[in-house]
Each structure stands twice: as structure tokens, then as C-alpha cells.
């Protein structure tokens, strides 16, 4: 059997491999050692017994989408049946005091691989026995502690494979410089040690995306905006736009990034090198926001001008492929997809990202101020309580609701929250009366709201003992 027979549904073409060369990966035309690594089809009854106590689930994730030329990282995590975990030695053990369907286990080990490897690997001094090899026959790398790595992961994509020895979690990074744009499929097959052979325990696949568009996200924030996710904002208050570029491998770290904004309100283009920008809309309506991000990223060098016609015949591309596929070294530039590149030359290519949003601008409450506070004299039966009137003004639209949150002087521990509808005149002047139980310093947060906005003001007040001679003080 060949790798593509085992790992994929169909034999990938050489064309696919040639157009998607992954550095350090091997062609899936290579032979697979079925004696050491048995192959079971989906539905084979042997899967039921591939793991003690249930099935192992493999979870494959990636930091896709990846900008072409950057690295994409794949992570595989194994999820064991209930009550099982990997210990520091790489053995699979039962968790203490954990009950599963079989009850508490007397044997602490699900798989004691340490004991197995001590029994079976003593046949030569190197520790490199004929079974410590990957499915293609390559020997396991002897990193420190490699004997505690008991899982073999075979990654397969674009007609190529990559083998990795690991524990219950592994990561593999792939450079996408030569990967065709668009969605691609990554498949992973996981084997576990089983004496002097291996047993398949899980298979998983996931789609990843390679793009030549910079992946761009924009967050928008505006003070007093009631709902930041509905793309409705308030007139006459600045909106802060923050551009996030998805670049987990830091491919663009050394690039100069330019942000070109069009806010759709006839204010023209705004170009910046800062990822945040503030913009205030002064009219109500619907506006089309457009952002173009431009970065000079590392990229392939442009083809040199065509040389004068050769007097001797040029080697054919088919010959080129043959020498490349069979891993026999050829003259520089034999790689067909490198024909147009100049070795060791650092060329740059402009990459672009785009973001578009439709923004609705409406009237809202722009500002709220407490202009006066008055202690309301109360009849004698309530000596512990104080009634205070807050005279409040606002700017912008007319509020429909007022809320007061009374808390401790640090403004962290809420003691009392009261919300009530309000009916305010055009002048936006209202009085809010609130009760304070006992003397002391209080933090008062007062918000005025309508359907789209929520404006806040805060103050610290000092409520005196019920001595008529002591005045009410605004602590700040």
C-alpha cells in the first residue's frame, strides 16, 4: 500500500504536489508499512477494541485562515475516555477517585508503556529497534524523553504527508508559500504503541484556508452606544475603529501596514499607519464604511525578463519533475515552481485586506451632568434615611429611562439599583430622587437611556448624620 491508499480517498496528482510543495513533507506515493501499522477501513470491527475503556477522540484545529507565505499551525489533541489521562511518563492512567461505568479500577494503568518499552527494546544498545520507525520506515527521532512519546501522528494534505511522534497533544506548522489559494483539507491519523507494532486509534480531518487577502477584523466602540454589535451608532460622538489583523505566525511583523479609510460620509479618504482611528459622523443616515489594508509582505520574486533564445535545447519540464519527484538533486532551479525565482533574494509583494460595513447613525444622548444635589428634609420617623434630589441635564436626544446605581466609595460593591421611566421636556432637565440608608460616602452612577444610547455620569457623595446643620457634600 501507498500513503495515499491509507490516508486519502483518491490518489492525488503530481500536479497537486508540484503546486503545493510543503517543506519537509514527503510524497504520498511512498510505501506504507502495513505490517507495523495496520490499516482499518471505517466500520471495521477492530476499531471497537483499539482502546481500553472506549474510543479516543482526536480534535484537530488550526489557526486558519493563513495569508499565503505565512505559517499555519495545526494542533491535535487526544480526548481519552472518562477517568483516563496521560501521566508525566507518557503512560495512560486512571484518574484517582474517578468513577466510570466500570467503577473504580484496581490497576492504576490503562496502558503502561514504560514497562513495555523496557521489555521490548533491549535487543540492541542503540535503542533503535526495527519497530521504532514511522510508517514509511524512517526511524523515530531520539529527542530526550522520546520513549515517553507513545502516539504516532500522520498528517496528510495536498498529496504529501508528515509524521510526528508525540504525546496526547501535538502541533505542526506548515509554510504556505507554495500552497494553492482556497480551502484545503488536512487529515490526521493517530496510532498508539502496541507491543512491537502500532494500532490506529483515531482519524480526524479539518478544512483550512490559504488566502492572499490579509484577514482583517474591525471592532467599533463608541461611548454611550447601547449595543456595540448592531452597527448602529450615535451622531456627534466619535466612534473608535480598531483594526485587528489575523496574523498568528507574525508574518507581517516587519511590514509597514497602511490603513486607507473611507467613511462614506463625503469626508474623503483617510490614510494612516495606526491600527486605530476615531471618526465622528455629523449627520443621521446609513453610511458605507470601507477599509483597505495594505502590507508589503515577503513574497516570490518576479520572473526575470525572458533570456535570449537558447542555442541548445532547454531541459523539459517533465525531466525537471522527474528529478524533483525522485528526490535526486538536480541543478539549481530544477524545481518547476521555482523557475521564476532568484535564490536568496528577498522580494516583497503587496498584500491587501478589505473590510466593509454598513453603519447607521442616529440621534442619541450625548452627555449627562448632575448640576445640583439637594438634601430633602424628611419627617422624624425615618431618622436613618436620607432623601437626595439630583438635578440632571443632558444633551442630544431625550431619554426615556433613568437608572441609579448606588455603591460603596470604590464604586465596586453595588448596594442598590433603581431604574424608572422618565418623561422629560425638550430642555432635558430632570430631577431624580433617591434614598440613602445611613450616613457615609457613596458612589452614585446615574445613567440616562433611550433605545440606542446610554449616557453615564458618576459622582461620590457624602451623606451626613441626620443633623440638620450639616450640609450635603459632593465628595468629588
Amino acid at each position: 500500500k501507498r500513503f495515499h491508499d491509507v490516508l486519502g480517498n483518491e490518489r492525488p496528482s503530481a500536479y497537486m504536489r508540484e503546486h503545493n510543495q510543503l517543506n519537509g513533507w514527503s510524497s504520498d506515493e511512498n510505501d506504507w508499512n502495513e505490517k507495523l501499522y495496520p490499516v482499518w477501513k471505517r466500520g471495521d470491527m477492530r476499531w471497537k477494541n483499539s482502546w481500553k475503556g472506549g474510543r479516543v477522540q482526536a480534535v484537530l484545529t488550526s489557526d486558519s485562515p493563513a495569508l499565503v507565505g505565512s505559517n499555519i499551525t495545526f494542533a491535535v489533541n487526544l480526548i481519552f475516555p472518562r477517568c483516563q489521562k496521560e501521566d508525566a511518563n507518557g503512560n495512560i492512567v486512571y484518574e484517582k477517585n474517578c468513577r466510570n461505568e466500570a467503577g473504580l479500577s484496581a490497576d492504576p494503568y490503562v496502558y503502561n508503556w514504560t514497562a513495555w518499552s523496557e521489555d521490548s527494546d533491549g535487543e540492541n544498545g542503540t535503542g533503535q529497534s526495527h519497530h521504532n520507525v514511522f510508517p514509511d520506515g524512517k526511524p523515530f527521532p531520539h529527542h530526550p524523553g522520546w520513549r515517553r512519546w507513545n502516539f504516532i501522528y500522520v498528517f496528510h494534505t495536498l498529496g504529501q504527508y508528515f509524521q510526528k511522534l508525540g504525546r496526547c497533544s501535538v502541533r505542526v506548522s506548515v509554510n504556505t508559500a507554495n500552497v494553492t489559494l482556497g480551502p484545503q483539507l488536512m487529515e490526521v491519523t493517530v496510532y498508539r504503541r502496541h507491543g512491537r507494532a502500532y494500532v490506529p486509534i483515531a482519524q480526524v480531518k479539518d478544512v483550512y484556508v490559504v488566502t492572499d487577502q490579509i484577514p482583517v477584523f474591525v471592532t467599533m466602540f463608541q461611548k454611550n452606544d447601547r449595543n456595540s454589535s448592531d452597527e448602529t451608532f450615535l451622531k456627534d460622538l466619535p466612534i473608535m475603529f480598531d483594526v485587528l489583523i489575523h496574523d498568528p505566525s507574525h508574518f507581517l511583523n516587519y511590514s509597514t501596514i497602511n490603513y486607507k479609510w473611507s467613511f462614506g460620509d463625503n469626508t474623503g479618504l483617510f490614510v494612516s499607519t495606526n491600527h486605530t482611528v476615531n471618526h465622528t459622523y455629523v449627520l443621521n443616515g446609513t453610511f458605507s464604511l470601507n477599509l483597505t489594508v495594505k502590507a508589503a509582505a515577503p513574497g516570490p520574486c518576479p520572473p526575470p525578463p525572458p533570456p535570449p533564445r537558447p542555442s541548445k535545447p532547454t531541459p523539459s519540464l517533465a525531466t525537471t519533475l522527474k528529478s524533483y519527484d525522485s528526490n535526486t538533486p538536480g541543478p539549481a532551479g530544477d524545481n518547476p515552481l521555482e523557475l521564476s525565482r532568484i535564490p536568496d533574494e528577498n522580494c516583497q509583494i503587496n498584500r491587501y485586506g478589505h473590510f466593509q460595513a454598513t453603519i447607521t447613525i442616529v440621534e442619541g444622548i450625548l452627555e449627562v451632568n448632575i448640576i445640583q444635589m439637594t438634601d430633602v428634609l424628611m419627617p422624624v420617623p425615618w431618622p436613618e434615611s436620607s432623601l437626595i434630589d439630583f438635578v440632571v441635564t443632558c444633551q442630544g436626544s431625550i431619554p426615556t429611562e433613568v437608572c441609579t446605581i448606588i455603591s460603596d466609595p470604590t464604586c465596586e460593591i453595588t448596594q442598590n439599583t433603581v431604574c424608572s421611566p422618565v418623561d422629560v421636556d425638550e430642555m432635558c432637565l430632570l430631577t431624580v430622587r433617591r434614598t440613602f440608608n445611613g450616613s457615609g460616602t457613596y458612589c452614585v452612577n446615574l445613567t440616562l437611556g433611550d433605545d440606542t444610547s446610554l449616557a453615564l455620569t458618576s459622582t461620590l457623595i457624602s451623606v451626613p448624620d441626620r443633623d440638620p446643620a450639616s450640609p450635603l457634600r459632593m465628595a468629588n
Epitope: A14, G299, A318, L321, L339
Partner: antibody, heavy 119, light 107 residues
């Protein structure tokens, strides 16, 4: 919908060069390799080469190496095929064709450009 | 280069009858083989890719089969509009190569 629109017919003298354009629309231009295939009158189809619109990488068939140059203009979503040192046997209809991602079959073709080489 | 050999060069079949075209590759290209139909004055039209997958909108009377080096295009019931030249193409490796074509006519 996907469209590949090629430039008009050309008549050239032997030894001259011809540059044929192919303007793409209806899909993400940079995501698919573009190929050039030619067909001499009454003959079969012959693959000339391909270009990656994303970064300008090219592969040419050995027969045309040194005589063909494929280029791309991303701003107009157009690829170009220039054939130099023309001879009478280069008289043919030249097609651009879009590949299917990682697969080199062609679901989309230009309408063809007839290049006549005659003294 | 992979050489693609088509047979027969031409084929005359009665309306409603089965037409079979063969294509042989000089090396294993499985399953990377496509079939095209070309009518006079038009570009080729993709019928089958990856040996047996019918392209969107292609009538189901067209089917592809085969593996390794031997492939077949079958038109199960020939219609008048099927009169054309048919080409096979290997999409296994560069340089991409086409068969010489098979002309299908009505008997």
C-alpha cells in the same frame, strides 16, 4: 458567472511577436492558475503553460520555453500570453483556460483568439 | 511527457446507440483524467474530470470510467447534439497533455 474574455484576432509576420490578453471576471482572480492551450487549424489541443495570478509564478511546456512569456495584471484581472519569433506553424487559435484549484482540468475557457502568421 | 493515445480517430454511431471512446496513457495517471467535447468554432467543454466525475450540467448519458492507463468515455444513447470531437486530457502532471481527438458522427 465566471467569464474569460480574450482579445481579438491578430495577423503577424514571421519573426514578429504577438501578445494575447484574457480578462477574467466572476470569481476570485488570484485563487486559480490560468493556462494557455492552442489549437492549430484542424488539429488537436496543445498545452503551452500556466501562470499563478496571485504571485506571477509560471510553468511553460518545454516546446515553448524561451519563446513564451505569461504575465498578469492583478489590477485589471487580466493575464497575457506573449509568443515571440513567430513562424507559420504558430498559426492557431489560442485559448486561456482556468484550472479547478488544485486540479488541472478546465471548466472555463476563453472564446479563443485566432493568430495568423503569414508573410 | 505523458503521451495520450485516443482511439478510434472517428466513430459513426446511430442515434440512440452507445458510443465508446478509449484513451490510453503512456504511464499511470489514475484518476487524473478529463474528457472534453468540442464543436466547430467553439472552445472545448468539460464533460468528465478525475476519470469518472460528471461536471455540473453535463447530461447523465455521458459517463467516464477506467484507471491506471486505460480510460473510457461512454455516451449511452447518442443524440444529434453530441456530434463533436472528443478529447481526453491527463491532469496528473506537467506538461498537461491531450489525446489526438475522436470525431463522433451520426451513422
Amino acid at each position: 458567472q465566471v467569464q474569460l474574455v480574450q482579445s481579438g484576432a491578430e495577423v503577424k509576420k514571421p519573426g514578429a511577436s504577438v501578445k494575447v490578453s484574457c480578462k477574467a471576471s466572476g470569481y476570485t482572480f488570484t485563487s486559480y492558475w490560468m493556462h494557455w492551450v492552442r489549437q492549430a487549424p484542424g488539429q488537436g489541443l496543445e498545452w503551452m503553460g500556466e501562470i499563478n495570478p496571485s504571485d506571477g509564478r509560471t510553468n511553460y511546456a518545454q516546446k515553448f520555453q524561451g519563446r513564451v512569456t505569461m504575465t498578469v495584471d492583478k489590477s485589471t484581472s487580466t493575464v497575457y500570453m506573449e509568443l515571440s519569433s513567430l513562424r507559420s506553424e504558430d498559426t492557431a487559435v489560442y485559448y486561456c483556460a482556468r484550472s479547478g484549484g488544485n486540479y488541472a482540468w478546465f471548466a472555463y475557457w476563453g472564446q479563443g483568439t485566432l493568430v495568423t502568421v503569414s508573410s | 511527457d505523458i503521451v495520450m493515445t485516443q482511439s478510434p480517430d472517428s466513430l459513426a454511431v446511430s442515434l440512440g446507440e452507445r458510443a465508446t471512446i478509449n484513451c490510453k496513457a503512456s504511464q499511470d495517471v489514475s484518476p487524473s483524467l478529463a474528457w472534453y467535447q468540442q464543436k466547430p468554432g467553439q472552445p472545448p467543454k468539460l464533460l468528465i474530470y478525475s476519470a469518472s466525475y460528471r461536471y455540473t450540467g453535463v447530461p447523465d448519458r455521458f459517463s467516464g470510467s477506467g484507471s491506471g492507463t486505460d480510460f473510457t468515455l461512454t455516451i449511452s444513447s447518442l443524440q444529434a447534439e453530441d456530434v463533436a470531437v472528443y478529447y481526453c486530457q491527463q491532469h496528473y502532471s506537467i506538461p498537461l497533455t491531450f489525446g489526438g481527438g475522436t470525431k463522433v458522427e451520426i451513422k
